[in-house]
Amino acid sequence: LKGQEFAPSHQQVYAPLRADGDKPRAHLTVVRQTPTQHFKNQFPALHWEHELGLAFTKNRMNYTNKFLLIPESGDYFIYSQVTFRGMTSECSEIRQAGRPNKPDSITVVITKVTDSYPEPTQLLMGTKSVCEVGSNWFQPIYLGAMFSLQEGDKLMVNVSDISLVDYTKEDKTFFGAFLL
Amino acid sequence: LKGQEFAPSHQQVYAPLRADGDKPRAHLTVVRQTPTQHFKNQFPALHWEHELGLAFTKNRMNYTNKFLLIPESGDYFIYSQVTFRGMTSECSEIRQAGRPNKPDSITVVITKVTDSYPEPTQLLMGTKSVCEVGSNWFQPIYLGAMFSLQEGDKLMVNVSDISLVDYTKEDKTFFGAFLL
Amino acid sequence: LKGQEFAPSHQQVYAPLRADGDKPRAHLTVVRQTPTQHFKNQFPALHWEHELGLAFTKNRMNYTNKFLLIPESGDYFIYSQVTFRGMTSECSEIRQAGRPNKPDSITVVITKVTDSYPEPTQLLMGTKSVCEVGSNWFQPIYLGAMFSLQEGDKLMVNVSDISLVDYTKEDKTFFGAFLL
């Protein structure tokens, strides 16, 4: 019987058990981004593939309109990788003219939107200065951590510049979460 | 009793329960790589330490000949870090001569081989242009995500250039997976 | 019935079941670092926020004096991201003078201290040469993997240069662990 431990003689109280296979889980993969209007000073959100190829959602974890919808309160591991690629950054051009400059940058933010708080919450941020000298550059930013989420919370991935996101392969740019 | 939830009054059906401690898990660490033959247009696979130091495999997750062998179908979190190091890349030399060039790059791919699909599937890719100017450079690429795997699937880590992999320390280059 | 597997006819013995919600877990976030004395050739350890904002500890996972204390033996997923930022590295200045040099670097180490071993164990290391040309640079190093830990073990995050750590936002620099 659950709750009757073998080593200690005292009764131990546990939260209700649940099978691992029925926990909310999702792995979303990159798709070509359609330009969308976003507000000034707000990074645009990526949208995602949720059922083709490696992508899936299961056990009431749903994807809709750029958001992963959290169906059940609990602790979730959330992760994303965004691969960026671009031409030589302005920074290096300016640098060549002998004027040091604040470098260009690439940023990924995993954001939570919740009913109980008026502002979106930035859960994770990966930000990197880009001061490449070669004519083409590319690099990933990876993020992952555990957060306590509430039923109804929504998760999205925002980036500093949607036009620099590598959308060519599902293994290069992705976003996922699973209930622990 | 499992299946009898406290909140809803209706009966809920669950998959069989299982103890977390008996789930397939592995953490593999880097070893010095012996040059192996690999076919054209195919990145070479790393081989790994599976029992010394920090490395382990448990609960029927086995390692053999570059592959982690998946003993049970389910959702796995898979991760790897590869630390690369090298001398100044050709890119910077060519750049100094005033000719911009496609930069050198370093790439890590976590690949699945499955008997239900005729070609290997790239699950995760981290790829980065390398255009370093200092005489020696080093940097890690980290990857991690969740995938649905089938019993009998095989996982490996492929890299763009095995000679650039830092094999000196078990904490710098590693590969792991665990059933959620 | 738990313990009665469907495929094999023999009885299988399982470890006691336990609810996921009562497993030790922590997510710690960056705070401004007070300069502390650290020994030569030893990277300083970061200290952390453990209860405000996104940070939490639960189910007997405690934080004290730079250390996460492991309350229960088992396999843990451990992760950290440290965002570094700095001014132009010495490397690029020297390079401009025409003298190639060993580049500056940034390093993160997740370290385990255990009663049963006299030396701290480096579990994970992310190390990167920094040879930036722009006047300001910033970038994250992310680490994460699974390790078998013992009750009483202590975890910390060490960095090569505490003055380069970006402590401004809880989503940029963090440290966490959870029992699988």
């Epitope: - | 033959q37 570059k66 592959f67 081989v113 499955t114 008997d115 239900s116 005729p118 095989k154 | -």
Partner: antibody, heavy 116, light 106 residues
């Protein structure tokens, strides 16, 4: 160049054991999976089973499971098939097949006749 | 076992015709494979993962479908396409093939 070559006796007596070997070249067998498929005269294709040469792990067609054994010898780049207690109904062309690595590859087939 | 029901069992068409073969699985599968077998030869993979063309296969061959219903198409039949075509699912144990469709030229 990827090659798979089946070999073994073309004639087997009823109730005896059919044994075939597949020798491969041009790829690392451990990176893939090796299958046996047969085709009885005028009939379709029947999957018999597969082995993961890296681990030795096998899966068999349940309809043949009690009679079929697939093994591998990675040092010789060979996979073997044994089918016990054969009858005339086991007369077929037996193919060795690679999966898990593109291109999908088949041997040319080995005709085995079961007759007294 | 997952049963694969292939239709038609044979067909006759003219050069240049569009030819369609269907395969129905008794339960849903993710991936479907299509093979071509010429007399006295081993089968050759044409389509994998339901719709991916194997290397070196002419683009007149295509595949589509998901779940239980899959279709194989030759957009413009050529004389060298005379063969028997098989569908196969690789997922359930055992792997199973359709019974084959023999394609002939009118």
């Amino acid at each position: 160049q990827v090659q798979l070559q089946e070999s073994g006796p073309g004639l087997v007596r009823p109730s005896q054991t059919l044994s075939l070997t597949c020798t491969v070249s041009g790829f690392d067998m451990g990176d893939t999976y090796m299958h046996w498929v047969r085709q009885r005269p005028g009939r379709g294709l029947e999957w018999m089973g597969r082995i993961d040469p890296a681990s030795g792990h096998t899966k068999y067609n349940p309809s043949l499971k009690s009679r079929v054994t697939i093994t591998r010898d990675t040092s010789k780049n060979q996979v073997s098939l044994r089918l016990s207690s054969v009858t005339a109904a086991d007369t077929a062309v037996y193919y060795c097949v690679r999966s898990g690595g593109m291109p999908d590859a088949w041997g040319q087939g080995s005709l085995v006749t079961v007759s007294s | 076992d997952i049963q694969m029901t292939q239709s038609p069992s044979s067909l006759s068409a003219s050069v240049g015709d569009r030819v369609t073969i269907t395969c129905r699985a008794s339960q849903g599968v993710r991936y479907m494979y299509w093979y071509q077998q010429k007399p006295g030869k081993a089968p050759k993979l044409l389509i994998y993962g339901a719709s991916n063309l194997a290397s070196g296969v002419p683009s007149r061959f295509s595949g589509s479908g998901s779940g239980t219903d899959f279709t194989f198409t030759i957009s413009s039949l050529q004389p060298e396409d005379i063969a028997t075509y098989y569908c196969q699912q690789w997922e359930g144990n055992p792997r199973t093939f359709g019974q084959g469709t023999k394609v002939e030229i009118k």
